[in-house]
């Protein structure tokens, strides 16, 4: 499955939108930094068959979409930027879902690498727990926004590697 060129443009647009979403000076949030334990090893792209890599990417985008679709998120971010960001993520999910169906048929492998999917889910659970503990403060959201930008960058790099394998 070849992810369309529009998919990588969508990735870039999503990152740009996320960068634009900042509402407070992030310099005031230094002490709120937190180790969310991003599962970097799940995104190095070496140990995966393509179908498994795509399913991990799908989970990453799905969880990001879920995180930014909550009421708390709506209260934290400028609405039009948030809607555009969610739309980009939704389009990426559609692209990835189409690819998952194709790849599973080709490789005849299980849909998901369960351990990798679980690692991504636990990562987002830690993010949600952090936001809850910080009472969804502006700085907590800034830290999470920075973290998601970093994790989406890893996702983008994995997608680039997958395209090079084609």
């Amino acid at each position: 499955c070849d992810l369309p060129q529009t998919h990588s443009l969508g990735n870039r647009r999503a990152l740009i939108l996320l960068a634009q979403m900042g509402r407070i000076s992030h310099f005031s949030c230094l002490k709120d930094r937190h180790d969310f334990g991003f599962p970097e090893e799940e995104f190095d792209g070496h140990q995966f068959q393509k179908a498994q890599a795509i399913s991990v990417l799908h989970e990453m985008i799905q969880q990001t979409f879920n995180l930014f679709s909550t009421e708390d998120s709506s209260a934290a971010w400028e609405q039009s930027l948030l809607e555009k960001f969610s739309t980009e993520l939704y389009q990426q999910l559609n692209d990835l879902e189409a690819c998952v169906i194709q790849e599973v048929g080709v490789e005849e492998t299980p849909l998901m690498n369960e351990d990798s999917i679980l690692a991504v889910r636990k990562y987002f659970q830690r993010i949600t727990l952090y936001l809850t503990e910080k009472k969804y403060s502006p700085c907590a959201w800034e830290v999470v926004r920075a973290e998601i930008m970093r994790s989406l960058s890893f996702s983008t790099n994995l997608q680039k590697r997958l395209r090079r394998k084609d």
């Epitope: 960068a19 992030h26 002490k31 930094r33 969310f36 800034e142 830290v143 920075a146 973290e147 960058s153």
Partner: antibody, heavy 121, light 107 residues
Framework: EVQLVQSGAEVKKPGESLKISCKGS????????IGWVRQMPGKGLEWMGI????????AYSPSFQGQVTISADKSISTAYLQWSSLKASDTAMYYC??????????????WGQGTLVTVSS | DIQMTQSPSSLSASVGDRVTITCRAS??????LNWYQQKPGKAPKLLIY???SLQSGVPSRFSGSGSGTDFTLTISSLQPEDFATYYC?????????FGQGTKVEIK
């Protein structure tokens, strides 16, 4: 390979202006902040200020606020430190260093080689 | 501003010695404390970040500990290349501040 390459040594007269540079390579320039640190001859390290190249937001140490200006041009992955009117007391080595921003990663993990600024009449 | 106080300001030690440098913050900084090594004419080098995490490529003889206001950098067995000046730096809030430095000299 991550690198921060600073502009060369400068010799200036009091009252002159100056802009020194720090060019980042080998990483996503807008994903890290760039900090500036002063070291006067035989003295310790002093943090001057920092810039987020993604939006050019800046923060300064109160000691340096109004004395220097930090800027960045993300199109050429370069941060700048400038003076509008140098004083003899600005004679020092100036370092730039990258900072991970709000991410949980090592602070100031890569440094430039330093730019020696000498101000003398 | 958060004041950082290092002690001692200088020390003399021999190769193989265990060396301890302390750093105290004027208010709690949790674990937001970094340690740097600087040799004459060179840029500082990050050794330890977030109080106890060893920076990639730094020898394991270097270790950091502490939280709140009191922190320690330990060199378990001093090597010839370790003679340098060491700085702590709080990473808790702006303005970032450094300790005044500890010069480790050959006895």
């Amino acid at each position: 390979e991550v690198q921060l390459v600073q502009s060369g040594a400068e010799v200036k007269k009091p009252g002159e202006s100056l802009k020194i540079s720090c060019k980042g390579s080998g990483y996503s320039f807008t994903s890290y902040w760039i900090g500036w640190v002063r070291q006067m001859p035989g003295k310790g390290l002093e943090w001057m200020g920092i810039i987020d190249p993604s939006d050019s937001d800046t923060a300064y140490s109160p000691s340096f606020q109004g004395q220097v200006t930090i800027s960045a041009d993300k199109s050429i992955s370069t941060a700048y430190l400038q003076w509008s009117s140098l004083k003899a007391s600005d004679t020092a080595m100036y370092y730039c260093a990258r900072h991970p921003g709000l991410n949980w990663a090592p602070d100031f993990d890569y440094w430039g080689q330093g730019t020696l600024v000498t101000v003398s009449s | 501003d958060i004041q950082m106080t290092q002690s001692p300001s200088s020390l003399s030690a021999s190769v193989g010695d265990r060396v301890t440098i302390t750093c105290r913050a004027s208010q709690s900084i949790d674990e937001f404390l970094n340690w740097y090594q600087q040799k004459p004419g060179k840029a500082p080098k990050l050794l330890i970040y977030f109080a106890s995490s060893l920076q990639s490529g730094v020898p394991s003889r270097f270790s950091g500990s502490g939280s709140g206001t009191d922190f320690t950098l330990t060199i378990s067995s001093l090597q010839p290349e370790d003679f340098a000046t060491y700085y702590c730096q709080q990473a808790h809030s702006f303005p970032l501040t450094f300790g005044q430095g500890t010069k480790v000299e050959i006895k």
